[in-house]
């Protein structure tokens, strides 16, 4: 399977909420013998590999933000820790996997990465990631709402395959 980032750039005004999204593509097994681990973290654009550095999002690590669920289930973070930091990650039945960040500040600007680990019990595991950029703006040049820019299909930085 692959992970795609429908939007490669999110430009938002300070104080707004935003939902960053990754989407699983390809043959995603929804059986009982499959478990998905999904998480989010901040990173930087490396010269060779995007997303290799794992930095916290608002002081929460990728461990704090992870979800795990069976192939036939949806999930979301309900723990207080994430919500106290204005964060919520969620996953639905259709392969969409998102993190919502509330009340954005300039400090939230940067590169965000999603990571998905698919565990096929008794068989194998695969891990894939995707990257997108968030720009938080203030002042007269800031948009009134978040503006999203679709990823180009040629942009291999945003899709990794297993």
């Amino acid at each position: 399977f692959k992970v795609a980032t429908p939007y490669s750039l999110y430009v938002c005004p300070e104080g707004q909420n935003v939902t960053l999204t990754c989407r699983l593509l390809g043959p995603v097994d929804k059986g009982h013998d499959v478990t998905f681990y999904k998480t989010w973290y901040r990173s930087s654009r490396g010269e060779v590999q995007t997303c290799s550095e794992r930095r916290p999002i608002r002081n929460l690590t990728f461990q704090d933000l992870h979800l795990h669920h069976g192939g036939h289930q949806a999930a979301n973070t309900s723990h207080d820790l994430a919500q106290r930091h204005g964060l919520e990650s969620a996953s639905d039945h259709h392969g969409n996997f998102s993190i919502t960040m509330r009340n954005l500040t300039l400090l939230d600007s940067g590169l965000y990465c999603c990571l998905v680990v698919e565990i096929r019990h008794h068989h194998s595991e695969h891990r894939v990631h995707g990257a997108m950029e968030l720009q938080v703006q203030t002042g007269k040049d800031a948009p009134s709402n978040c503006v999203v820019y679709p990823s180009s299909s040629q942009d291999s930085e945003n899709i990794t395959a297993a």
Epitope: S52, Q63, E125, T160
Partner: antibody, heavy 120, light 106 residues
Framework: QLQLQESGPGLVKPSETLSLTCIVS??????????WGWIRQPPGKGLEWIGS???????HYNPSLKSRVTIPVDTSKNQFSLKLSSVTAADSAVYYC????????????WGQGTLVTVSS | DIQMTQSPSSLSASVGDRVTITCQAS??????LTWYQQKPGNAPKLLIY???NLETGVPSRFSGSGSGTDFTFTINSLQPEDVATYFC????????FGGGTKVEIK
């Protein structure tokens, strides 16, 4: 601080079953974010992953050893085991138990290892 | 199975030298590669994960790089305590290890 400790016989006869146990302290084996695995190292050689067990009891095994390996888990005792059947001298090695973080990927905590010799 | 080919199998260098070890995967593993240090009689110790991330507490003279199939591990200034065997391991799929590189002091 998480600690893993291997235990079991140091000498096993050919064709018998090698049985080792890994006792985990300082953390719960039932934690959902980890694999618990076995790795071995024949004297003077490299590392070979044997297999891992997921908190739910599901397993992954090295395809080359799959027909001979079982990794049971006992959450009530916070331990997991290795059973390797029909052993030969080629199975003589230091056997390590280790924890793998699913999201990070590598084996981040290891036991100190126990030497098992297969000999009659 | 993903095969990991590590080279050289052994090397000897002087204190202060820059030491480089390579690891090649039989297929693309993105950056899902780790490096371990193993001293005689001890279990392996995690040094680097995700090809280039230094584990907490590991000296900065150790570094890793690479992506896809080709990876490099570097000790910037070899110290006597770095005498050990170093292993790479991929975790893109079921774990497999490289054959190891024994590092000695001249």
């Amino acid at each position: 601080q998480l600690q893993l400790q291997e235990s079991g016989p140091g000498l096993v006869k050919p064709s018998e079953t090698l049985s080792l146990t890994c006792i985990v302290s300082g953390g719960s084996i039932s934690s959902s974010g980890y694999y618990w695995g076995w790795i071995r190292q024949p004297p003077g050689k490299g590392l070979e992953w044997i297999g891992s067990i997921f908190y739910s009891g599901n397993t992954h095994y090295n395809p080359s050893l799959k027909s001979r390996v079982t990794i049971p888990v006992d959450t009530s005792k916070n331990q997991f085991s290795l059973k390797l059947s029909s052993v030969t001298a080629a199975d003589s090695a230091v056997y390590y138990c280790a924890r793998r973080d699913i999201l990070t990927g590598p084996f981040d905590y290891w036991g100190q290892g126990t030497l098992v010799t297969v000999s009659s | 199975d993903i095969q990991m080919t590590q080279s050289p199998s052994s090397l000897s260098a002087s204190v202060g030298d820059r030491v480089t070890i390579t690891c090649q995967a039989s297929q693309d593993i993105t950056n899902y590669l780790t490096w371990y240090q193993q001293k005689p009689g001890n279990a392996p110790k995690l040094l680097i994960y995700d090809a280039s991330n230094l584990e907490t507490g590991v000296p900065s003279r150790f570094s890793g790089s690479g992506s896809g199939t080709d990876f490099t591990f570097t000790i910037n200034s070899l110290q006597p305590e770095d005498v050990a065997t170093y292993f790479c391991q991929q975790y893109d799929n079921l774990p497999t290890f490289g054959g190891g590189t024994k590092v000695e002091i001249k």
